[in-house]
């Protein structure tokens, strides 16, 4: 903490301006009024203060607002935001999307810091749900944001917000997250026609059940192998050779290159070898003639 010392004669700050960069830390503490600082926070960002000087300015605001800063100050924190701890941020009540954007801008280009994570958490909890505008903003700054949320947190995303999601936003999502997002996407895009619907739903198909994949196989969608490889194993296993052939269309030839990988490998093992042979791809490992084909649903009964 900076010691309390009297402000030297003639040095009392009348406004926040560049002259303050020549003030020593103790002079800033003694000569800058916290209330003046709060009303002129927007000027701080334009002045090249040192980190030590910014520490003093933060200290003055902390003294003025021990219960947490008001949004009028938060919105203009600028680089002073980088000095805030998660504990500081937990005292805030941020409701304006503009405030959120202003602070995210400060951290732009960097990984999500604990401060930013706390800020987002406070903002979203304050709103009660992840609305479209918020999701738009967050994924613009952090494409992986959606996949950083737990399935429980994702459940608060309204289907209308799904329109804001881009394919790259789902790149790091795991199966449990896609299980939550897929039904929302299905609902959001339900009024689109076949080909347009497939374009939109494609990124979410890692959460699709077997019956939806069977339905898609009847629509000439020509799913690419990259999408097929991201499907749930339990959703792929019940598909017949004919259904997979229809689902993939001309991309069915790509199965050969993926035959050692999941879920293709598991699917191959559950098909009759005769059926696999009809694809003409040389896929091996299917069930030989004469063997009983066991359904996955028999798992409980058999074990």
């Amino acid at each position: 903490e900076v010691e309390k010392t009297a402000c030297p004669s003639g040095k009392k700050a009348r406004e926040i301006d560049e002259s303050l960069i020549f003030y020593k830390k103790w002079e800033l503490e003694a000569c800058v009024d916290a209330a003046l600082l709060a009303t002129q926070m927007d000027r701080v960002n334009a002045i090249p203060f040192t980190y030590e000087q910014l520490d003093v300015l933060k200290h003055k605001l902390d003294e003025l607002y021990p219960q947490g800063y008001p949004e009028s100050v938060i919105q203009h924190l600028g680089y002073l935001f980088l000095k805030m701890s998660p504990e500081d941020i937990r005292k805030w009540n941020v409701t304006s999307l503009e405030t959120l954007k202003a602070l995210l801008e400060v951290n732009k280009g960097h990984e999500m810091s604990p401060q930013v994570a706390t800020l987002i958490d406070r903002f979203v909890k304050g709103r009660g749900q992840l609305d479209k505008d918020t999701l738009d903003t967050l994924t613009a700054f952090y494409p992986g944001y959606l996949c950083s949320l737990s399935p429980e947190e994702l459940s608060s995303v309204p289907p209308s917000s799904i329109w804001a999601v881009r394919p790259q936003d789902l790149d790091t999502c795991d199966p449990r997250q896609l299980d939550v997002l897929y039904p929302k996407a299905r609902l959001a895009f339900q009024n689109m026609n076949g080909s347009e619907y497939f374009v939109k739903i494609q990124s979410f198909l890692g959460g699709a059940p077997t019956e939806d994949l069977k339905a898609l196989s009847q629509q000439n969608v020509s799913m690419d192998l990259a999408t097929f490889m991201k499907l749930r194993t339990d959703a792929v296993l019940p598909l017949t050779v004919a259904e997979v052939q229809k689902l993939l269309g001309p991309h069915v030839e790509g199965l050969k290159a993926e035959e050692r990988h999941r879920p293709v490998r598991d699917w191959i093992l559950r098909q009759r070898q005769d059926d696999l042979d009809t694809l003409g791809l040389g896929l091996q490992g299917g069930i030989p003639n004469g063997y009983l084909v066991l359904d996955l649903s028999m798992q409980e009964a058999l074990s």
Partner: antibody
Framework: QVQLQESGPGLVKPSETLSLTCTVS??????????WSWIRQPPGKGLEWIGY???????NYNPSLKSRVTISVDTSKNQFSLKLSSVTAADTAVYYC???????????WGQGTMVTVSS | DIQMTQSPSSLSASVGDRVTITCRAS??????LNWYQQKPGKAPKLLIY???SLQSGVPSRFSGSGSGTDFTLTISSLQPEDFATYYC?????????FGGGTKVEIK
């Protein structure tokens, strides 16, 4: 509940064939939901997957051991077996049999059996 | 074949600590990543499958995350019974591979 139990000789001479059997109780090797694997662990070292078999007889082996390994299944006895030929001291390890649930991982393991290769 | 690299190879921690173990695959394995716990003289035990799903009966202090090539196992508050060796394992490729293991010891 499903249990796995390994059995076989604890000592094998170099150049001979190591033979182990895993008996499944409380479940069936004929289930379409599982792969039946062998995994080994040399003393003080990490885990090495040897291979698996599916009820249909389809097998998949570790490429570094493929030329020496055979895994087979006997559905009538509810067992699956491992044969590893031309063994050397480097094959000394605890050998585990394990069930792999296709939707998860190796969810059930045998308690393991120590096999020493020595003359 | 796909190499699985675990870090650290060992760590010392106290009861109540938050512990994080990472596993990196040499190529993308989607979410086909499992975590196991092994205690001396015992068979490994499945903790987490499909990168983030908790195996039935495993305490909720264990959690997993990641997809593609980078994965994490977290123990939120280390308990005395958690001192063991932890292994990651990929099942994306037909040639299954394990990480080298991370030994969690008492500080």
């Amino acid at each position: 509940q499903v249990q796995l139990q390994e059995s076989g000789p604890g000592l094998v001479k170099p150049s001979e064939t190591l033979s182990l059997t895993c008996t499944v109780s409380g479940g069936s090797v004929s289930s379409g939901s599982y792969y039946w694997s062998w995994i080994r662990q040399p003393p003080g070292k990490g885990l090495e997957w040897i291979g698996y078999i599916y009820y249909s007889g389809s097998t998949n082996y570790n490429p570094s051991l493929k030329s020496r390994v055979t895994i087979s299944v006997d559905t009538s006895k509810n067992q699956f077996s491992l044969k590893l030929s031309s063994v050397t001291a480097a094959d000394t390890a605890v050998y585990y049999c394990a069930r792999e649930d296709v939707l998860s991982g190796f969810d059930i393991w045998g308690q393991g059996t120590m096999v020493t290769v020595s003359s | 074949d796909i190499q699985m690299t675990q870090s650290p190879s060992s760590l010392s921690a106290s009861v109540g600590d938050r512990v994080t173990i990472t596993c990196r695959a040499s190529q993308s394995i989607s979410s086909y990543l499992n975590w196991y716990q092994q205690k001396p003289g015992k068979a490994p035990k499945l903790l987490i499958y499909a990168a983030s799903s908790l195996q039935s009966g495993v305490p909720s202090r264990f959690s997993g995350s990641g997809s593609g090539t980078d994965f994490t196992l977290t123990i939120s508050s280390l308990q005395p019974e958690d001192f063991a060796t932890y292994y990651c394992q990929q099942s994306y490729d037909a040639f299954y591979t394990f990480g080298g293991g991370t030994k969690v010891e008492i500080k």
